[in-house]
């Protein structure tokens, strides 16, 4: 009796261990989205970046959705959000309209239920990109830990989008779930 | 009968809880490597930094390997990778040969199976460090979420390595596993 | 007999699954603290920032303690720590005392048992904020993976605190536990 139960228990527990491990370690949502440079807006004003790759090169997504330029949360939780935004200019691209630039990024959260948009994180710098130098570059990195609810949307706004570096290692943002909400 | 089984089950579950918790929370790979300043290359060109501490001060490693200047992945998974690189110059450290600097970091992944190296993340800035100022400083931070396979190697390349800040709180990189691959 | 035991086991395992999931995913400590601008020190010297929100807007804390301007660890573990610090100046705020600035952040760990304070991470930049521009902005981001013991305290020091951006999306720091200590 008790030997049979022990064996059966070990078997059930074994499969449960697999299931638990899978459910914990594999179902955790994440995304790493890289800039799609074929559709970067021009201008120096602040714009929302809507074109991102989610399934090529380093870009990937799981248990989250990318739609209409926004990263949509499918699972309540606490997430670590991050963004890396690179700006660059070479003199061969033409003269800058101004040497005084505000190079900024804003990571925003939009709630559909209560139509509102809020900035979670911002970063950047004012720069003086003089014509004396043939090449200019600047990167911003921001990151933070936030409570996100299913249906909420994360988007990226930048100033001077025409100066964005289009490489996948340069301009990207992402998120990964760290823990459930109590 | 059933009381005995319940007691036995509680005992087995208790140890399983310990085991599961240990296997989940302790076996997760990580590394935090700090610059070893005794062997920083000179020059202004882009170089791979090969000297890092892994077991002193804030530096530590577990279930990953550090070898030949590279952080080697031992366990498939999705990892959060990060780097913080500080550059500095004091007038007593010698005269700058140029005021126009590109201070950059590149976090690269090398696959041994398919010998190839790819940049996962880059960051930095062009800077104008005038001789009029006695001290200059600049830090770069990058971070992102990447799928890494066992045997793949992470390394750090920087421009102007002779300007690196050798403090352990200044120049470091690291990784920690967040979840398994589906 | 054995059918009854199986049903009972499934029921116990079910609740255990909930318990395990909760204990793992919900008990993990975290904090995201945003600057309390009502009490920012003046001056250009390096100071410890002691006023942070922990329960309004994006600010939150769980299984950690905020006291006397310090984030106190309640649970041993490996944590990812991060900080985002924004500095800004508008000409309407008056002239800067100097155009040459060191804008820096230091994330420090204090151990009560062995009274000592150590810098875990630093970042920043020297800046030339010329009077030719009406607005200046600069952000720093640092992050890293550290072993923290119960009772240890994390605090933030900055230079030029009077230039801090008081927005919750601009100046914040945080931590979340990633794994236990072996």
């Amino acid at each position: 009796g008790s030997q049979h139960i022990r064996a059966e228990k070990a078997m059930v527990d074994g499969s449960w261990l697999d299931l638990a491990k899978r459910s914990k370690l594999e179902a955790q949502p994440f995304a790493h989205l890289t800039i799609n440079a074929t559709d970067i807006p021009s201008g120096s004003h602040k714009v929302s970046l809507s074109s991102w790759y989610h399934d090529r090169g380093w870009a990937k997504i799981s248990n989250m959705t990318f739609s209409n330029g926004k990263l949509i949360v499918n699972q309540d939780g606490f997430y670590y959000l991050y963004a890396n935004i690179c700006f660059r200019h070479h003199e061969t691209s033409g003269d800058l309209a101004t040497e005084y630039l505000q190079l900024m990024v804003y990571v925003t959260k939009t709630s559909i239920k209560i139509p509102s948009s809020h900035t979670l994180m911002k970063g950047g710098s004012t720069k003086y990109w003089s014509g004396n130098s043939e090449f200019h570059f600047y990167s911003i990195n921001v990151g933070g830990f936030f409570k996100l609810r299913s249906g909420e949307e994360i988007s990226i706004e930048v100033s001077n989008p025409s100066l964005l570096d289009p490489d996948q290692d340069a301009t990207y943002f992402g998120a990964f779930k760290v823990r459930d909400i109590d | 009968g059933s009381q005995h089984i319940r007691a036995e089950k509680a005992m087995v579950d208790g140890s399983w809880l310990d085991l599961a918790k240990r296997s989940k929370l302790e076996a997760q790979p990580f590394a935090h490597l700090t610059i070893n300043a005794t062997d920083i290359p000179s020059g202004s060109h882009k170089v791979s930094l090969s000297s890092w501490y892994h077991d002193r001060g804030w530096a530590k490693i577990s279930n990953m390997t550090f070898s030949n200047g590279k952080l080697i992945v031992n366990q498939d998974g999705f990892y959060y990778l990060y780097a913080n690189i500080c550059f500095r110059h004091h007038e007593t450290s010698g005269d700058l040969a140029t005021e126009y600097l590109q201070l950059m970091v590149y976090v690269t992944k090398t696959s041994i199976k398919i010998p190839s190296s790819h940049t996962l993340m880059k960051g930095g800035s062009t800077k104008y460090w005038s001789g009029n100022s006695e001290f200059h400083f600049y830090s770069i931070n990058v971070g992102g979420f990447f799928k890494l396979r066992s045997g793949e190697e992470i390394s750090i390349e920087v421009s102007n390595p002779s300007l690196l800040d050798p403090d352990q709180d200044a120049t470091y990189f690291g990784a920690f596993k967040v979840r398994d691959i589906d | 007999g054995s059918q009854h035991i199986r049903a009972e086991k499934a029921m116990v395992d079910g609740s255990w699954l909930d318990l395990a999931k909760r204990s793992k995913l919900e008990a993990q400590p975290f904090a995201h603290l945003t600057i309390n601008a009502t009490d920012i020190p003046s001056g250009s010297h390096k100071v410890s920032l002691s006023s942070w929100y922990h329960d309004r807007g994006w600010a939150k804390i769980s299984n950690m303690t905020f006291s006397n301007g310090k984030l106190i660890v309640n649970q041993d573990g490996f944590y990812y720590l991060y900080a985002n610090i924004c500095f800004r100046h508008h000409e309407t705020s008056g002239d800067l005392a100097t155009e040459y600035l060191q804008l820096m952040v230091y994330v420090t760990k204090t151990s009560i048992k062995i009274p000592s304070s150590h810098t875990l991470m630093k970042g920043g930049s020297t800046k030339y904020w010329s009077g030719n521009s009406e607005f200046h902005f600069y952000s720093i981001n640092v992050g890293g993976f550290f072993k923290l013991r119960s009772g240890e305290e994390i605090s933030i020091e900055v230079s030029n605190p009077s230039l801090l951006d008081p927005d919750q999306d601009a100046t914040y720091f945080g931590a979340f536990k990633v794994r236990d200590i072996d």
């Epitope: 004396n132 | 920083i40 000179s42 020059g43 202004s44 060109h45 007038e91 007593t92 450290s93 010698g94 005269d95 700058l96 040969a97 140029t98 005021e99 126009y100 600097l101 005038s130 001789g131 009029n132 102007n160 002779s162 300007l163 | -």
Partner: antibody, heavy 122, light 108 residues
Framework: EVQLLESGGGLVQPGGSLRLSCAAS????????MSWVRQAPGKGLEWVSG????????YYADSVKGRFTISRDNSKNTLYLQMNSLRAEDTAVYYC???????????????WGQGTLVTVSS | EIVLTQSPGTLSLSPGERATLSCRAS???????LAWYQQKPGQAPRLLIY???SRATGIPDRFSGSGSGTDFTLTISRLEPEDFAVFYC?????????FGQGTKVEIK
């Protein structure tokens, strides 16, 4: 081939002024930091002054600070050293030398010009 | 500022012999940032070694440099007649760039 040719040396009285020139050829002049190094008769070498490729930053030995001014004209591929308030101890052969351009810090000197003699005497 | 002391002041050797010249710094030279030059009478100095041990272009392999920290050495494995001259070390790890006072290698 890199060539550096100094000129402008000569005899000058204490308190007087002199301007040295160094004509450069064989390399992209504006891309390299340049320096002046001097050698008093029968003595060793002393670095005097340096300038970045753009000319935006200049550096001086304490012994000449406030009296000497280094400059360059990148359009003419020429380096200058304006020497004012000259003293007897400034008597030396003055060499112009090119920075290697391989490090971000001004480093060794290679190559050197043939030098021009400055004599400060009454 | 760093002081570089060269020894000996004069080295009297015959062609074919090995020459060992020392350069000692008053404090550690950052990053092995040290160079060696050769100067013959009436000529400008010529770069031999940079980075403590890297030979400059066109310099014969009988010239070698070594050392780090505060102690550096220039070695000429077999002296040729054209090698007799004054040799200077120079540090560039800190400002200002400083030369040693020189070592004269003369024919015995």
């Amino acid at each position: 081939e890199v060539q550096l040719l100094e000129s402008g040396g000569g005899l000058v009285q204490p308190g007087g002024s002199l301007r040295l020139s160094c004509a450069a050829s064989g390399f992209t002049f504006s891309s390299y930091a340049m320096s002046w190094v001097r050698q008093a008769p029968g003595k060793g070498l002393e670095w005097v002054s340096g300038i970045t490729g753009s000319g935006g930053s200049t550096y001086y030995a304490d012994s000449v600070k406030g009296r000497f001014t280094i400059s360059r004209d990148n359009s003419k591929n020429t380096l200058y050293l304006q020497m004012n308030s000259l003293r007897a101890e400034d008597t030396a052969v003055y060499y112009c030398a090119k920075d290697p351009g391989t490090t971000v810090i001004m480093s060794w000197f290679d190559p050197w010009g043939q030098g021009t003699l400055v004599t400060v005497s009454s | 500022e760093i002081v570089l002391t060269q020894s000996p002041g004069t080295l009297s050797l015959s062609p074919g012999e090995r020459a060992t010249l020392s350069c000692r710094a008053s404090q550690s030279v950052r990053g092995r940032y040290l160079a060696w030059y050769q100067q013959k009478p009436g000529q400008a100095p010529r770069l031999l070694i940079y980075g403590a041990s890297s030979r400059a272009t066109g310099i014969p392999d009988r010239f070698s440099g070594s050392g780090s920290g505060t102690d550096f050495t220039l070695t000429i494995s077999r002296l040729e007649p054209e090698d007799f001259a004054v040799f200077y070390c120079q540090q560039y790890g800190s400002s200002p760039r400083i030369f040693g006072q020189g070592t004269k290698v003369e024919i015995k």
